[in-house]
């Protein structure tokens, strides 16, 4: 057998090249036939209409012939056949890749609330061989199920993916790529999580700055909530006992002027929002004043203040404490 | 520059073997990128293909349907030549008969001049 | 009958062109062979394939086909194109076929 050919691989409506090689020539005729076994060339004569067909090259040693735009309809056996005493004949199978015709990602719901488990499909339409689908959810690989639809030699292939949500997948892309031999680079599609959350909720010390809250001293309390949607209703509140009479409210913030002993408590701030209901708390304990000692004869504003703060630090054996100060986030 | 010529008698009797030889000028039978053909024109059937003969690395016939049961189409590479023998004939084989050479299997690029070929009693 | 169809005759002033067409199956998927036959004389090539003439075929023959018809073009025809056109492909298991053939009178 001298008579040689090689298999041929080719991305639908490209070019495909079959070639007829004769390894020791001797003249005789080289002819190139399709799967249905008709003649595409008798040595440099195309009888077949098909004008896709192009001569690159005739000799007594090769027959060099392209097929341009090539469809699924073109895959198979062509044969070429060599005259010689006996004559001989080979084969080379064209084999057509087809890219998925399109990619579409469906999202069960447009809007997920946290902690529900939804479900993610991927679909890539007609491609052969069936497509390959991985997901990410942002960086991370995530493990989807997959089904496989063949009709007419092509394949649709649709991924499953169920996807518990949290509150931090809002705004998260989730990614279905797609892997292919036809496919050069990455192939891809996104859908946005939007993740609904309750509220999650913070208190900021405003005033006093230094954090410790003294008789007769103010107290202003921040109230932070964020959620999804944003919580419609932040309201304060004082555990177990009545609002100061002296307090003011004033949408997230809490005022309480000239404290005393008696505002000691829990105030609580809570949000809420469609999805649920959140509060945070601060424990207030209000210090002693500080001591206040005579101004020595001689008045050095700058060492006073520092003895001041010495003094007062020494004199409140709890002014250090700042545990007794603390929020609690629930 | 080929040429072909076609030899036999003019006049057949039904019944008998109507036999036409065609000799080649120029070329061979035996080339290995030519057919051999013999085609008939009467008024009534028009242009009509009997068969071929071509060698790729051996010999090869095809014959028409419709004369199948009693044609054979030999060649003879001592003289250069191929022969037609039509058996069984009849008044409706009256034609002028064709030798032609035909580029592979696809189209007739030389003819012989002809001759007609009456069948009668 | 015929496995490929021509119409039996055509005629075109001198200096025109007329058009010689041929339909069958068979030209869906292989081209036609076209040939002109004065009287008294055997057939002669004149196109091939998708569209070659033979050495010593005027220029003003030429050939085209789509779908199941094949169609000989003579521009600018000439006293001596007057002659039957036979056109020429194979049938659906391989044998030759020829069409019933065009007589062109040229006026």
């Known amino acids: 057998q001298n008579l040689f050919t090689k298999d041929v691989t080719v991305i639908e409506g490209e070019v495909a090249t079959i070639s007829c090689q004769v390894n020791k020539s001797d003249d005789s005729v080289i002819q190139l036939l399709n799967p249905n076994r008709q003649t595409i060339y008798f040595r440099d004569f195309r009888p077949l209409k098909d004008s896709r067909f192009q001569l690159l090259n005739f000799s007594s040693s090769e027959l060099k012939v392209s097929l341009t735009n090539v469809s699924i309809s073109d895959e198979g056996r062509y044969f070429c056949q060599l005259y010689t005493d006996p004559p001989q004949e080979s084969y080379t199978t064209i084999t057509v890749l087809v890219p998925p015709r399109n990619l579409m990602i469906d999202i069960q719901k447009d809007t997920a609330v946290e902690g529900e488990e939804i479900e993610v499909n991927c679909t890539a339409m007609a491609s052969k061989p069936a497509t390959t689908i991985r997901w990410f959810k942002g960086n991370t690989e995530l493990k989807g199920k997959s089904e496989v639809e063949e009709w007419s030699d092509m394949y649709t292939v649709t991924s499953q993916l169920m996807l518990k949500v949290h509150k931090e997948d809002d705004g998260v892309p989730v990614i279905c790529q797609v892997e292919h031999p036809a496919v050069t680079g990455n192939l891809q599609t996104q859908r946005y999580l939007e993740v609904q959350y309750k509220p999650q909720v913070h208190i900021q010390m405003t005033y006093p700055l230094q954090g410790l809250t003294r008789e007769g001293d103010a107290l202003e309390l921040t109230c932070e909530a964020i959620g999804k949607p944003q919580p419609v209703m932040v309201t304060w509140v004082r555990v177990d006992d009545e609002m100061p009479q002296h307090a003011v409210l004033s949408g997230p913030n809490l005022f309480i002027n000239n404290l005393n002993k008696t505002d000691n408590g829990t105030y609580r701030c809570e949000a809420s929002n469609i999805v649920g209901k959140a509060h945070s708390d601060y424990m207030l304990y209000v210090y002693d004043p500080p001591t206040t000692i005579p101004p020595p004869t001689t008045t050095t504003t700058t060492t006073t203040t520092t003895t001041t703060t010495i003094l007062t630090i020494i004199t409140d054996s709890r002014a250090g404490e700042e545990g007794s100060i603390r929020a609690v986030d629930h | 520059q080929v040429q072909l010529q076609e030899s036999g008698p003019g006049l057949v009797k039904p019944s008998q073997t109507l036999s036409l030889t065609c000799a080649i000028s120029?070329?061979?039978?035996?080339?290995?990128?030519?057919?051999w053909n013999w085609i008939r024109q009467s008024p009534s059937r028009g242009l009509e293909w009997l068969g071929r003969?071509?060698?790729?690395?051996?010999?090869?016939?095809d014959y028409a349907v419709s004369v199948k049961s009693r044609i054979t189409i030999n060649p003879d590479t001592s003289k250069n030549q191929f022969s037609l023998q039509l058996n069984s004939v009849t008044p409706e084989d009256t034609a002028v008969y064709y030798c032609?050479?035909?580029?592979?299997?696809?189209?007739?690029?030389?003819w012989g001049r002809g001759t007609l070929v009456t069948v009668s009693s | 009958s015929s496995e490929l169809t021509q119409d039996p005759a055509v005629s075109v002033a001198l200096g025109q062109t007329v058009r010689i067409t041929c339909q069958g199956d068979?030209?869906?998927?292989?081209?036609a062979s076209w040939y002109q036959q004065k009287p008294g004389q055997a057939p002669v090539l004149v196109i091939y394939?998708?569209?070659n003439r033979p050495s010593g075929i005027p220029d003003r023959f030429s050939g085209s086909s789509s779908g199941n018809t094949a169609s000989l073009t003579i521009t600018g025809a000439q006293a001596e194109d007057e002659a039957d056109y036979y056109c020429?492909?194979?049938?659906?298991?391989?044998?030759?076929?020829f069409g019933g053939g065009t007589k062109l009178t040229v006026l």
């Open positions: 020429n492909s194979r049938d659906s298991s391989g044998n030759v076929v």
């Open positions: 068979s030209l869906r998927s292989y081209y």
């Open positions: 120029g070329d061979s039978v035996s080339s290995n990128s030519a057919a």
């Open positions: 394939g998708k569209n």
């Open positions: 003969t071509y060698y790729r690395s051996k010999w090869y016939n």
């Open positions: 032609a050479r035909e580029y592979g299997i696809w189209y007739f690029d030389l």
